[in-house]
């Protein structure tokens, strides 16, 4: 028995930040769970983890240097990624694991979300307008 996950097919991070919402076919209320976000087709990089427990406040962390935060809904976890680089444009997969109560449950692999990180467009400074036309 697997949890189904829905995510947006594509998101654009214009300001080097993005909210990625992972929607589950499962209610996380009063469950112990580990929600994670993985980068790459092979999900090789674990970008962010949200750990939830019925008796504790939500804990969010990244072991891989990403600046991330997380918010919990009844059937969703939203990952807020900041300070993204253009070269971190990639496909990102949501994963959910329910540790308690038994039995352990996890999700069918989702289709993922392509996050396209747009570089900040630097406007020319008025002090240095560039070469003037003849």
């Amino acid at each position: 028995n697997k949890i189904l996950v829905k995510q947006s097919p594509m998101l654009v991070a214009y300001d080097n930040a993005v909210n990625l919402s992972c929607k589950y076919s499962y209610n996380l209320f009063s469950r112990e769970f580990r929600a994670s976000l993985h980068k790459g087709l092979d999900s090789a990089v674990e970008v962010c983890v949200v750990y939830g427990n019925y008796s504790q406040q939500l804990q969010v962390y990244s072991k891989t240097g990403f600046n991330c935060d997380g918010k919990l809904g009844n059937e969703s976890v939203t990952f807020y990624l900041q300070n993204l680089y253009v070269n971190q444009t990639d496909i990102y997969f949501c994963k959910i694991e329910v540790m308690y109560p038994p039995p352990y449950l996890d999700n069918e692999k989702s289709n993922g979300t392509i996050i396209h990180v747009k570089g900040k467009h630097l406007c020319p400074s008025p002090l240095f307008p560039g070469p003037s036309k003849p």
């Epitope: 580990r34 939830g52 694991e97 308690y100 038994p102 352990y104």
Partner: antibody
């Protein structure tokens, strides 16, 4: 209270196998990894591998991948580490320890250790 | 694999001394560094997790600092029960690895 209780000392001949058990109590078995760490006489700590009882996924140190087998019996909250083709340099104290599955970075509770002696 | 290098490998100190042990990681492990104390014939005990957080029940004379590749364990005023071997361990990526240990002996 939270405890990890290991099986007793073993003496084995080279080439044989040994299976060490680790019985967990006082916590939710499926909320934690069980790790195995060994310490040769007078030496430091060496991580062998870990198993998550929830889905029985394992991670192994490459050095032990072909000789160590980690298993669990969730019905009795017990983890096992079997090491095959024993050599004299496998003589060590073998510890089980745990790390939280959701917050996995440190080992907060340890078993008392099981001495395994490999000698002809 | 991430290599963890501890120094010194041993040191002699007196009760009341301030003792500092360092641990170097072969690559950036951010704050995913833990410290353990081990006494002869016993299992290791967790002292510090995530570089600077004191584990429950550990005296406040123990403190940890650092991030990235360089970390420090400090015992502000050494007590008789602190004579032991100390290990660092990285919890950033598998395989988890330990430093070689630092034995703190009585001068």
């Amino acid at each position: 209270q939270v405890q990890l209780v290991q099986s007793g000392a073993e003496v084995k001949k080279p080439g044989a196998s040994v299976k060490v058990s680790c019985k967990a109590s006082g916590y939710t078995f499926t909320s934690y990894y069980i790790h195995w760490v060994r310490q040769a006489p007078g030496q430091g700590l060496e991580w062998i591998g870990c198993i998550y009882p929830g889905n029985v996924n394992t991670n192994y140190n490459e050095k032990f991948k072909d000789r160590a087998t980690l298993t669990v019996d969730t019905s009795i909250s017990t983890a096992y580490m079997e090491l095959s083709r024993l050599r004299s340099d496998d003589t060590a104290v073998y510890f089980c320890t745990r790390s939280h599955y959701g917050l996995d970075w440190n080992f907060d509770v340890w078993g008392q250790g099981t001495t395994v002696t490999v000698s002809s | 694999d991430i290599q963890m290098t501890q120094s010194p490998s041993s040191l002699s100190a007196s009760v009341g001394d301030r003792v500092t042990i360092t641990c170097h990681a072969s690559q950036n492990i951010y704050v995913w560094l833990n410290w353990y104390q081990q006494k002869p014939g016993k299992a290791p005990k967790l002292l510090i997790y995530k570089a600077s957080n004191l584990h429950t029940g550990v005296p406040s004379r123990f403190s940890g600092s650092g991030s990235g590749t360089d970390f420090t364990l400090t015992i502000s005023s050494l007590q008789p029960e602190d004579f032991a071997t100390y290990y660092c361990q990285q919890g950033q990526t598998y395989p988890y690895t330990f430093g070689g240990g630092t034995k703190v002996e009585i001068k």
